[in-house]
């Protein structure tokens, strides 16, 4: 359950609205991606978590916000800059990158809400998008033209 | 905005429990994965978006469901059984399989909220996990023991 | 101002395919998705399915029997329908129409194309 | 699939009356349905989103009601430029429905 304070206004206040205030700018993680530093890691395992098993692995690592609603997000972190061979599962194939995908998640921020006369009545949930990374995906290189 | 009604229970519940009740239930999708209705879509581009210049190619398909936040899922299905090769991106390479990552996505369903004796009074969240496919990865297949 | 413009006219021997485009201008392309309906002469409204340009998501309405593919692109604030396997009565008119939303409440198609008929004979 | 069914499929009326149309969806919908006026020759246009309202630019002599499985479009006043085909269209789920149109006269 959660133990966040009431998110209930006070009467009068557009309790919908204030509740689930819309957001498009995205959030950036709280924590920047760091270079893998686990370099013996980047190879694909034939057993295990998919993420392991990928010809394009990787890690998660957590984010955790506790006025943050889920509170521990996830974000993928790439072994390898170009793909693993499916055929050794080991030397890296340098006709394929390994590529984050992303995606704006939807998360709630709590926030004080202000009752009428601008005193304090307990939490509100905003709304907003956040970006995360979900997995690394093996991908031919783009061609420019 | 939300033009949902007032999700606060009446005086004297438990705001928080009310309003975000947890179920670790995780919801299946409303449909089922789908073989793939347009084979020709199994080849790895050389530009477009992730999606389409993965060697595990996938498209999105939409899951919208009014009563839930966010209404709109998407759900990915791929468009080839195993990896496109990086050689030619159109030939499937037989040593990977193009799997689907799953992910437990937090999400709130929109229910009745009752009053002290039983009446309705607006709408409360529910907390739920639901079954969402983020990606098709391309993986070693696994070696049985 | 928002403005959806279709390709024009066109005649198709049964069995052939048809690919439909649908220019976007005056708003973002990607924000909204692109809904495509059709009309057959003197017949109700049939919803074909949608488009996310964002990210390429789809729903398409299983009445076509996987006849129907639906693309973007992005570059060029085009969505496109393509519809194979062609019989006559599949004659009519094809819209594009924009999907407007708020949070909670509404999807509706707020902005149409001009209409493009399609004659199979 | 939901059905949507609308009722007249065509009425004649005169500059002024107030005219009602009707439809019906064969499941609980809430209130999500949108009308749709088509002027003979025209592309549609939106009317009335979210059962009763009304879109930016649409004279408030429209409205709409209903929840559930009844829906009812009104004209308060009917002027010569309402002469159109209107339809309704459910959103709760995909596929999304039209009713087969009610095609508005004036007498």
């Known amino acids: 359950y959660s133990h966040w304070p009431s998110c209930c206004p006070s009467k009068g206040q557009d309790t919908s609205e204030e509740l689930l205030r819309w957001s498009t700018v995205p959030v950036p993680p709280l924590e920047p991606a760091r270079p893998n530093r686990h370099p013996e890691s980047c190879r694909a395992s034939e057993d295990g978590p998919l993420n392991s098993r990928a010809i394009s692995p990787w890690r998660y690592e957590l984010d955790r916000d506790l006025n943050r609603l889920p509170q521990d997000l996830y974000h993928a972190r790439c072994l390898c800059p170009h793909c693993v061979s499916l055929q050794t599962g080991s030397h890296m194939d340098p006709r394929g990158n390994s590529e984050l995908l992303y995606h704006n998640q939807t998360v709630f921020y709590r926030r004080p809400c202000h009752g009428e006369k601008g005193t304090h009545k307990g939490y509100c949930l905003e709304r907003r998008l956040y970006r995360v990374s979900l997995a690394c995906v093996c991908v031919r290189p783009r061609v420019m033209g | 905005y939300s033009h949902w009604p007032s999700c606060c229970p009446s005086k004297g519940q438990d705001t928080s429990e009310e309003l975000l009740r947890w179920s670790t239930v995780p919801v299946p999708p409303l449909e089922p994965a789908r073989p793939n209705r347009h084979p020709e879509s199994c080849r790895a581009s050389e530009d477009g978006p992730l999606n389409s210049r993965a060697i595990s190619p996938w498209r999105y398909e939409l899951d919208r469901d009014l009563n839930r936040l966010p209404q709109d899922l998407y759900h990915a299905r791929c468009l080839c059984p195993h990896c496109v090769s990086l050689q030619t991106g159109s030939h499937m390479d037989p040593r990977g399989n193009s799997e689907l990552l799953y992910h437990n996505q937090t999400v709130f369903y929109r229910r009745p909220c009752h009053g002290e004796k039983g009446t309705h009074k607006g709408y409360c969240l529910e907390r739920r996990l639901y079954r969402v496919s983020l990606a098709c990865v391309c993986v070693r297949p696994r070696v049985m023991g | 101002e928002v403005q959806l413009v279709e390709s024009g006219a066109e005649v198709k021997k049964p069995g052939a395919s048809v690919k439909v485009s649908c220019k976007a201008s005056?708003?973002?392309?990607?924000?909204?998705?692109m809904n495509w309906v059709r009309q057959a002469p003197g017949q109700r409204l049939e919803w074909m399915g949608l488009i996310n340009p964002y990210n390429g998501g789809t729903s398409y309405n299983q009445n076509f029997k996987g006849r129907v593919t639906l693309t973007v692109d992005t570059s060029a604030s085009t969505a496109y329908l393509e519809l194979n396997s062609l019989r006559s009565e599949d004659t009519g008119v094809y819209y594009c129409?924009?999907?407007?939303?708020?949070?909670?409440?509404?999807?509706?198609?707020?902005?149409w194309g001009q209409g493009t008929l399609v004659t199979v004979s | 699939d939901i059905q949507m069914t609308q009722s007249p499929s065509s009425l004649s009326a005169s500059v002024g009356d107030r005219v009602t149309i009707t439809c019906s969806a064969s499941q609980g919908i809430s209130n999500y349905l949108n009308w749709y006026q088509q002027k003979p020759g025209k592309v549609p246009k939106l009317l009335i989103y979210y059962t009763s309202s009304l879109h930016s630019g649409v004279p408030s002599r429209f409205s709409g009601s209903g929840s559930g499985t009844d829906f009812t479009l009104t004209i308060s006043s009917l002027q010569p430029e309402d002469v159109a085909t209107y339809y309704c269209q459910q959103y709760l789920a995909f596929p999304y429905t039209f009713g087969q149109g009610t095609k508005l006269e004036i007498k």
């Open positions: 005056g708003y973002s392309f990607s924000g909204y998705t």
């Open positions: 129409a924009r999907e407007d939303y708020d949070s909670w409440t509404f999807f509706a198609m707020d902005y």
